[in-house]
């Protein structure tokens, strides 16, 4: 009963709730993660306990710095949600829970162009699709390097498309497109396309 | 289909020790909690130990020490070590499957060995 | 920890509305950690109920539970003949360690 008194007794500011997070709250699977469980108060011994659901996954004892749990998300149970406790003797508090969202990333985009050609002028448009990988995708479309689109949302596996028009150049050109959905620093391209100078006949995708 | 299927109970003398084993099938240990559970005759059912899907292991107070639980992922097999044993172990010993992420809602059972202890 | 469960034993008609109950001496992690299970004799227990209320699958509706923290209850709105079995309540703590518990178990008869 002492010790339950002495929980009683500590005032909320003095053991408040524990706080759980991470780096990384978009992730893939097979993706490492770690996670994070910290406490305001850096003069106690406390024991940090991770559960997700209601399965515990390991428990660490800290002073000042917060334990680190590090897990590997494989599964799509494996999303959370997660919450630690921070225990003293008999004290404890738990965190709010914390999930990720598991992404599929995205697949290569293929890049299709259709031109038609005027006298002075050619009118290209660029479609831009990635078949697999977490909706929304957004696209964004490039010529020789330089993004002359802003980024395109697909809340559904549509092409996007993006329009522009052209003087008849000298040189050729190359287009690409480039998805990406919400993981981090996860960008994919697609094959570049090349198209030719207008010298000749050769305008391999226009409409005749 | 999913199964347990528990052996390797039978008589053993006091102060001996017997190991069972908690064969799989159907699902990876990988991902489910097996739990085992044992009911003296006539008695209520007992709640031994835990092995969760990382490997981490629980064990009841009077089970510390004298009871082991491991596993073979290889194998898909749950092992409990008795050591020491005494005429009150005597029972019908159950491993169960928990859902996962929540290791005690045990939602597949094996069907039960029988472990005697006597002299 | 005690999982106390009362009464011990029940004696009933078929029909009739029946409830047991589950007393823990400390609350179940999350105050909802808490499986119902019936028991037949020679046969492996069956989940009834998980999270104190939900319904495990294939179970009929008859079956249902309540309670948080430390009380629970079991009912069973219109006990039909297949319904005579031992019944056990199991509660997930994490207070000192994580650990299970059982209920002492509630024999249902009939009358």
């Known amino acids: 009963r002492k010790a339950v008194l002495d929980c009683e007794a500590m005032k909320t500011n003095e053991f408040p709730s524990p706080c759980l997070d991470s780096k990384t709250k978009v992730v893939m699977k097979g993706q490492n993660v770690s996670m994070f469980c910290s406490h305001k108060n850096k003069s106690l011994q406390i024991t940090y306990s991770l559960f997700r659901r209601k399965t515990h996954l390991g428990t660490q004892d800290g002073k000042g710095e917060p334990a680190i749990f590090n897990l590997s998300i494989t599964e799509a149970h494996e999303s959370g949600p997660y919450k630690c406790k921070a225990q003293v003797t008999s004290c404890s508090k738990y965190s709010r829970d914390f999930s990720f969202t598991i992404v599929d990333p995205v697949t290569s985009p293929v890049l299709n162009i259709m031109v038609i050609q005027t006298e002075t002028d050619r009118h290209i448009t660029l479609h831009c699709l990635s078949v697999n990988g977490s909706l929304p995708i957004n696209y964004t479309f490039f010529e020789n390097h330089v993004a002359i689109s802003p980024a395109i949302s697909k809340y559904d596996r549509e092409p996007a498309e993006f329009n522009l028009t052209k003087k008849n150049p000298g040189e050729e050109e190359e287009y690409r497109c480039e998805a990406k959905n919400r993981l981090p620093n996860y960008a994919t391209y697609s094959h570049p396309v090349t198209m030719p100078s207008t010298g000749g006949d050769s305008c391999p995708f226009c409409l005749k | 289909e999913v199964q347990l299927v528990e052996s390797g109970g039978g008589l053993v003398q006091p102060g001996g020790s017997l190991r069972l084993s908690c064969a799989a099938s159907g699902f990876s240990l990988t991902i489910y909690t097996i739990t085992w559970v044992r009911q003296a005759p006539g008695k209520g059912l007992e709640w031994i130990g835990t092995i969760n899907s990382y490997g981490n292991t629980y064990y009841s107070t009077w089970a510390k020490g004298r009871f082991t639980i491991s596993r073979d992922n290889s194998k898909n097999t749950v092992y409990l070590q008795m050591n020491s044993l005494r005429a009150e172990d005597t029972a019908v010993y159950y491993c169960?499957?928990?859902?996962?992420?929540?290791?005690?809602?045990?939602?597949?059972w094996g069907q039960g060995t029988l472990v005697t202890v006597s002299s | 920890i005690q999982m106390t469960q009362s009464p011990s034993s029940l004696s009933a008609r078929v029909g009739d509305r029946v409830t047991i109950t589950c007393q823990s001496s400390?609350?179940?992690?999350?105050?909802?950690?808490l499986s119902w299970y019936q028991q037949k004799p020679g046969k492996a227990p069956k989940l009834l109920i998980y999270?104190?209320?939900r319904l495990a699958s294939g179970v009929p509706s008859r079956f249902s539970g309540s309670g948080s923290g430390t009380q629970f209850t079991l009912t069973i709105s219109s006990l039909q003949p297949e319904d005579f079995a031992t019944y056990y309540c199991?509660?997930?703590?994490?207070?000192?360690?994580?650990?299970?518990?059982f209920g002492t178990g509630t024999k249902v008869t009939v009358l």
């Open positions: 169960a499957r928990g859902y996962v992420d929540s290791d005690w809602y045990l939602n597949i």
């Open positions: 999270d104190a209320s």
């Open positions: 199991l509660g997930g703590y994490d207070s000192s360690g994580w650990y299970a518990a």
């Open positions: 400390e609350s179940v992690y999350d105050n909802n950690y």
